[in-house]
């Protein structure tokens, strides 16, 4: 969370921000709120990314203001016109790209005063991992397979009987770039799987972390999965 | 340490031609646009030319419109300004500037270029 | 092109003093307006950014007004390392231009 106040002079009000993950190719939120003000057309937004030459959005009298906007984001951005007047500023980006990535300003101006804060926007391609029993290997394997994923993450597999114990040893990954040329499709297998005990497929990197769970019983084969994004931290 | 180093200066004569570097380190290169920004001697400031963080976009000052080629080179962490067809009135200390939030925020020491005969 | 008219062109002062220095833009710029400072032989430092946002680790006594076509640098209670020429700055559109300088000297 960044609370940003940075402006010079007596009026100054309160913008925050939080640091978030764009996945590419799907539409992400780039989130600010501010103090809000009574009157619609008193508001100014402006969005900015550090190092390029135009603006990024600018919402102003009730209405989206793109005469300066940058081509970079030409026909991909919104505000949530009708949250403005209760103070979100966030900003929709359509279609991510892995050039989005970067440190953003939200630019607040109302009759109250002026405020801004910046948000630290990674980008990166994540997905949910399945993991499935493999009934074509010959002995008891497990298989995990996301996707899409970018930069290449880490595989590692755990087990609740076996708690601490490496897997590297009985386990294979492998990483299949996609058409697009930049996400990858990742694939891991574990060998030697015992029954009645839950297995963990954890996949990582710097943007975000998942796992899928599976237990295996003689009887049924429970599935569970969870995607989580790293350090979505306020300004 | 984020800085900036311009090379490349020096005496020319009119008609004459030069290529000015600037040396970028302590930051991502490739993320920001790149300007030149110029002072004659006990002159104010005067914008030349700015080239955007993916080289697709390059902007011109009147005065140097198709003379000067702004270009950037992000695998050695370089701008550079080609100088064509030198006038007299070119003569200036010839600052690179980071575009930072809409504004120049970091820039190099100058490097002076000379037109003279 | 946007011309960018500031004003004084040099003033003297004493240390202590409040100094204001006014930039006016040809035309509408909303906030898109910076502020330097340079020192003689030395590169321009960028002091304000988008009209009255503080650059990271520039002093408070500096701060930025204004909006549209009039804007204002005010320096609350000049030092001794103030003393230098100031420029505004227009960042709306291309050519980006300059104001002509305020040179502020020691009274």
């Known amino acids: 969370l960044i609370i940003g106040f940075g402006i010079s002079g007596r009026h100054s009000i309160t913008v925050t921000t939080v640091a978030s993950a764009g996945n590419i190719g799907e539409d992400g939120i780039l989130s600010c709120t501010f103090e809000p003000d009574i009157k619609l057309s008193d508001i100014v937004i402006q969005w900015l990314k550090e190092g390029v030459l135009g603006l990024v959005h600018e919402f102003k009298e009730g209405k989206d203001e793109l005469s300066e906007q940058d081509e970079m984001f030409r026909g991909r951005t919104a505000v949530f016109a009708d949250q403005v007047i209760v103070g979100n500023a966030s900003l929709r980006l359509k279609n991510v790209q892995l050039t989005d990535a970067g440190t953003y300003k939200c630019y607040i101006i109302t009759s109250k005063g002026k405020g801004n804060a910046n948000l630290e926007y990674k980008t990166g391609a994540f997905s949910m991992p399945e993991v499935n029993v493999d009934y074509n290997a010959s002995s008891e394997t497990l298989r995990c397979e996301a996707p899409r994923w970018f930069p290449q993450p880490t595989v590692v597999w755990a087990s609740q009987v076996d708690q601490g114990a490496n897997f590297s040893e009985v386990s294979n990954t492998s990483f299949e770039l996609n058409s697009e040329n930049v996400t990858m499709k990742v694939v891991s297998v574990l060998y030697n799987v015992t029954i009645n005990n839950t297995y963990s497929c954890m996949i990582e990197n710097d943007i975000a972390k998942a796992t899928g769970d599976i237990k295996v019983t003689e009887s049924e084969i429970k599935r569970r999965s969870h995607l989580q994004l790293l350090n979505s931290k306020a300004s | 340490e984020v800085q900036l180093l311009e090379s490349g200066g020096g005496l020319v004569k009119p008609g004459g031609s030069l290529r000015l570097s600037c040396a970028a380190s302590g930051f991502t290169f490739s993320s920001y646009a790149m300007h030149w920004v110029r002072q004659a001697p006990g002159k104010g400031l005067e914008w030349v030319a700015v080239?955007?963080?993916?080289?697709?976009?390059?902007y011109y000052a009147d005065s140097v419109k198709g003379r000067f080629t702004i270009s950037r080179d992000d695998s050695k962490n370089t701008l550079y300004l080609q100088m064509n067809s030198l006038k007299t009135e070119d003569t200036a200390v010839y600052y690179c500037?980071?575009?930072?939030?809409?504004?120049?925020?970091?820039w190099g020491q100058g490097t002076l270029v000379t037109v003279s005969s | 092109d946007i011309q960018m008219t500031q004003s004084p062109s040099s003033l003297s002062a004493s240390v202590g003093d409040r100094v204001t220095i006014t930039c006016r833009a040809s035309q509408d710029i909303s906030n898109r307006l910076n502020w330097y400072q340079q020192k003689p032989g030395k590169a321009p430092k960028l002091l304000i950014y988008l009209a009255s946002s503080l650059q990271g680790g520039v002093p408070s006594r500096f701060s930025g007004s204004g909006s549209g076509t009039d804007f204002t640098l005010t320096i609350s209670s000049l030092q001794p390392e103030d003393f230098a020429t100031y420029y505004c700055q227009q960042a709306i559109s291309f050519p980006l231009t300059f104001g002509g300088g305020t040179k502020v000297e020691i009274k």
């Open positions: 500037a980071r575009h930072g939030w809409d504004a120049f925020d970091i």
């Open positions: 080239i955007s963080y993916d080289g697709s976009n390059k």
